[in-house]
């Protein structure tokens, strides 16, 4: 089966790599523009230069292209705790990240928020904090994990999942009380 191709892909596949088919004349293959530039005018004929212009400040193209406009540079989202790792250049978009001792949580493919890495108080670090994943904590006896923090079993209500983890602790407390009454 032949994979389905979009119109642009169909047109480009007629020409050798690094060239694209002239939109008004399908017998002409024009050279694509280098990254950092965009298509100002198609080549007038075979073997003639494509008119490519450099992207203006605040825009970029990261690969060879025949785009009529450069892409707008991304802005780091301060409200999401993001910081700029590297600024936008004509051939590379802005790179955003998080501060030290923070990790990225992706709410969607193109939206992340920075959160502080868990310190595992009342527990131990099972896996260290990574760029896109919080610390994984293992809680000490008498504590259970809630929202990645080790919380005392005294805060465990019967309706919560923690009852399984805290059950031995609860039984110990009952046992101590029982032995004290004899």
């Amino acid at each position: 089966l032949v994979p389905h191709l979009g119109d642009r892909e169909k047109r480009d596949s007629v020409c050798p790599q690094g060239k694209y088919i002239h939109p008004q004349n399908n017998s002409i293959c024009c050279t694509k523009c280098h990254k950092g530039t965009y298509l100002y005018n198609d080549c007038p004929g075979p073997g003639q230069d494509t008119d490519c212009r450099e992207c203006e400040s605040g825009s970029f193209t990261a690969s060879e292209n025949h785009l009529r406009h450069c892409l707008s540079c991304s802005k780091c989202r301060k409200e999401m705790g993001q910081v700029e790792i590297s600024s936008c250049t004509v051939d590379r978009d802005t790179v955003c990240g998080c501060r030290k001792n923070q990790y990225r949580h992706y709410w969607s493919e193109n939206l992340f928020q920075c959160f502080n890495c868990s310190l595992c108080l009342n527990g131990t670090v099972h896996l260290s904090c990574q760029e896109k994943q919080n610390t994984v904590c293992t809680c000490h006896a008498g504590f259970f994990l809630r929202e990645n923090e080790c919380v005392s079993c005294s805060n465990c209500k019967k309706s919560l999942e923690c009852t399984k983890l805290c059950l031995p602790q609860i039984e110990n407390v009952k046992g101590t009380e029982d032995s004290g009454t004899t």
Partner: nanobody
Amino acid sequence: EVQLLESGGGLVQPGGSLRLSCAASGFTFAHETMVWVRQAPGKGLEWVSHIDRVGQDPYYADSVEGRFTISRDNSKNTLYLQMNSLRAEDTAVYYCALLPKRGPWFDYRGQGTLVTVSS
């Protein structure tokens, strides 16, 4: 006590419009980034849009870009979501929430308002 109360949902035909509102109380509304999330039947929460405290540079999910507009009125402690050119896939319960601070969960979220897009 933080309270978020959504309204404005209902049944609408494809291509139609709705305006959701979220009345906020119990915190300083003007200091918080506010979020709209939605949950379609049998699916997880999807981030729809958010707006910072002064209402600049709102974010939209690709699925709603160009059709939905988020806004806020800090004098009325109210968040809005104007939804145009509605599609069947926009059918969901829509929740307004405060931007999470401690971790990737919603400490403060409303009860939601149901939007059904159907002919």
